[in-house]
């Protein structure tokens, strides 16, 4: 029947020794050796039935033997419940009394017992881990229970096992077994992928800046599998990630900020049980110099009839190396006035009385001028040469 | 304490043009004054500012040759002629007086105003 479990597969119990068949040889008359001799060290196989939850013991004797009270058909003994001891009384015409007693030490249901994966996803493309779990209740006293594993060439002992450092999408090949009072009653075979591990480091060919706002970087990928890379750039606090294609090679940064040191990590990943990230490489650069952003806050104060002070903040973006203010006045269009200073904090004397002036403050980076703030301001006619004197608001 | 109100905004045609006036009222009008003006969502921003008695002058790059301020020290009142508008030139337009601790003659900073009108409301359409 199918209901029946092969017992190699799964559900063999057999004491450790093979059946010996004891004979004693008399020159004139041949006797029989007595039934607990002959069967002294007889063998059974338990053979599970899955749906009646019910073992039969087979019984390993080269001929069809007497059971005594407990009938037995083919040397098989029916209807046995786990965890319970029976006992039969084995005899056969080969042999005289006494008759063998067998205690028949039933083993727990095969289905109380689960080979299960624990292996940590984290860590399951270096490692395996199988547990015998139970997963009913039963009755037979857990002591007697014993666990072996074989995987490759390790044996262990135990209910649990953790193979660790192994090569990643590797097969593994462990086969286990159960014993009930040192006689194997199921066993069981897994054969086991460790899982895709971390992808190798990709290997930078150039990283660099020719212009402003762009950047490049090319590289060559890792030799292990992966799925896609991660392309980092962080300028001072600041860390802005790119998820690539994996076909990619190259890929030119834009929008970047001038004169602006950036470093960049590039790594390789996979999505397997979890997502593993290979190491990352990394590079540097700086960017090029650009026109600084326009001064702000321009003002533009009389200190006098003739005099003015000048003043702005700085740019919001100085996109070079050095910081210098300029300040060009302007009458008309000649320029009368062309002044540096390293704050923005011009004090203009002397000007001409009564003229339209233009006052145009910049900020120079060493590179590049930026972009002029423009005000316009006229002197007034000298109060000084007149006779009555004001007060100066 | 000097109050100034402000007068004279409205809708205009761009090309068009329009004279803005400040009333000053409760105190002396000694002191530089100037306009500035601020545009939705931008911040205020210099126009045009004038002495004391007018003699000198000055003004934002993006009104210069179009704009004109002077002052009337007899009426209290301080002007701002607009001439050629265009629509960049929508804001609510501001008079300010200098503060008293002012050690300037003018200036463009408006730090340096003490005393601020209410504002009115100009408006370029194209």
């Known amino acids: 029947s199918d209901a029946y479990l092969n017992a190699s597969e799964t559900t063999t119990l057999s004491p450790s020794g093979s059946a010996v068949i004891s004979t004693t040889t008399i020159a004139t008359t041949p006797s029989k050796p007595t039934c607990d001799e002959k069967y002294a060290n007889i063998t059974v196989d338990y053979l599970y039935n899955k749906e009646t939850k019910l073992f039969t013991a087979k019984l390993n004797v080269n001929e069809n033997v007497e059971c005594g009270n407990n009938t037995c058909t083919n040397n098989e003994v029916h209807n046995l419940t786990e965890c319970k001891n029976a006992s039969v009384s084995i005899s056969h015409n080969s042999c005289t009394a006494p008759d063998k007693t067998l205690i028949l030490d039933v083993p727990p249901g095969v289905e109380k017992f689960q080979l299960h994966d624990c292996t940590q996803v984290e860590k399951a493309d270096t490692t395996i881990c199988l547990k015998w779990k139970n997963i009913e209740t039963f009755t037979c006293d857990t002591q007697n229970i014993t666990y072996r594993f074989q995987c490759g060439n390790m044996i262990f002992d135990n209910k649990e096992i953790k193979l660790e450092n192994l090569e990643p999408e590797h097969e593994y090949k462990c086969d286990s077994e159960i014993l009930y009072n040192n006689h194997k009653f199921t066993n069981a075979s897994k054969i086991i992928k460790t899982d895709f591990g971390s992808p190798g480091e990709p290997q930078i060919i150039f990283c660099r800046s020719e212009a402003a706002h762009q950047g490049v970087i090319t590289w060559n990928p890792p030799q292990r599998s992966f799925h896609n890379f991660t392309l980092c750039y962080i300028k001072e606090t600041e860390k802005d990630c790119l998820n690539l294609d994996k076909n990619l090679i190259k890929y030119d940064l834009q929008n970047l900020k001038p004169y602006t040191k950036y470093v960049l990590s590039l790594h390789a990943y996979i999505i397997a049980k979890v997502q593993r990230n290979g190491s990352a490489a990394m590079c540097h650069f700086t960017t090029k110099s650009a026109p600084p952003s326009q001064v702000w806050n321009m003002t533009v104060s009389m200190t006098s009839d003739n005099s003015m002070h000048v003043k702005c903040r700085p740019p919001r973006d100085r996109n070079g190396p050095h910081e210098r203010y300029h300040l060009e006045v302007e009458a008309g269009n000649t320029l009368v006035r062309n002044e540096s200073h390293k704050n923005c904090d011009f004090r203009v004397k002397d000007l001409q009385y009564s003229t339209d002036y233009t006052f145009k403050a910049y900020f120079h980076n060493g590179d590049y001028p930026g972009e002029p703030f423009i005000l316009h301001h006229s002197t007034s006619y000298n109060s000084k040469a007149h006779h009555h004197h004001h007060h100066h608001h | 304490q000097v109050q100034l109100q402000e007068f004279g905004g409205g809708l205009v045609q761009a090309g068009a043009s329009l004279r803005l006036s400040c009333a000053a009222s409760?105190?002396?009008?000694?002191?530089?004054m100037g306009w500035f003006r601020q545009a939705p969502g931008k911040e205020r921003e210099f126009v045009a500012t004038?002495?004391?008695?007018?003699?000198?002058?000055g003004y934002a790059d993006s009104v210069k040759g179009r704009f004109t301020i002077s002052r009337d020290n007899a009426k209290n009142t301080l002007y701002l002629q607009m001439d050629s508008v265009t629509p960049e030139d929508t804001a609510v337009y501001y008079c300010?007086?200098?503060?008293?601790?002012?050690?300037?003659?003018?200036?463009?900073?408006?730090?340096?105003?003490?005393?601020w009108g209410q504002g009115t409301q100009v408006t370029v359409s194209s």
């Open positions: 409760g105190g002396t009008f000694s002191y530089f």
């Open positions: 300010a007086a200098a503060r008293e601790s002012s050690v300037y003659y003018t200036s463009t900073d408006p730090a340096e105003y003490g005393y």
């Open positions: 004038i002495n004391r008695n007018g003699g000198a002058t």
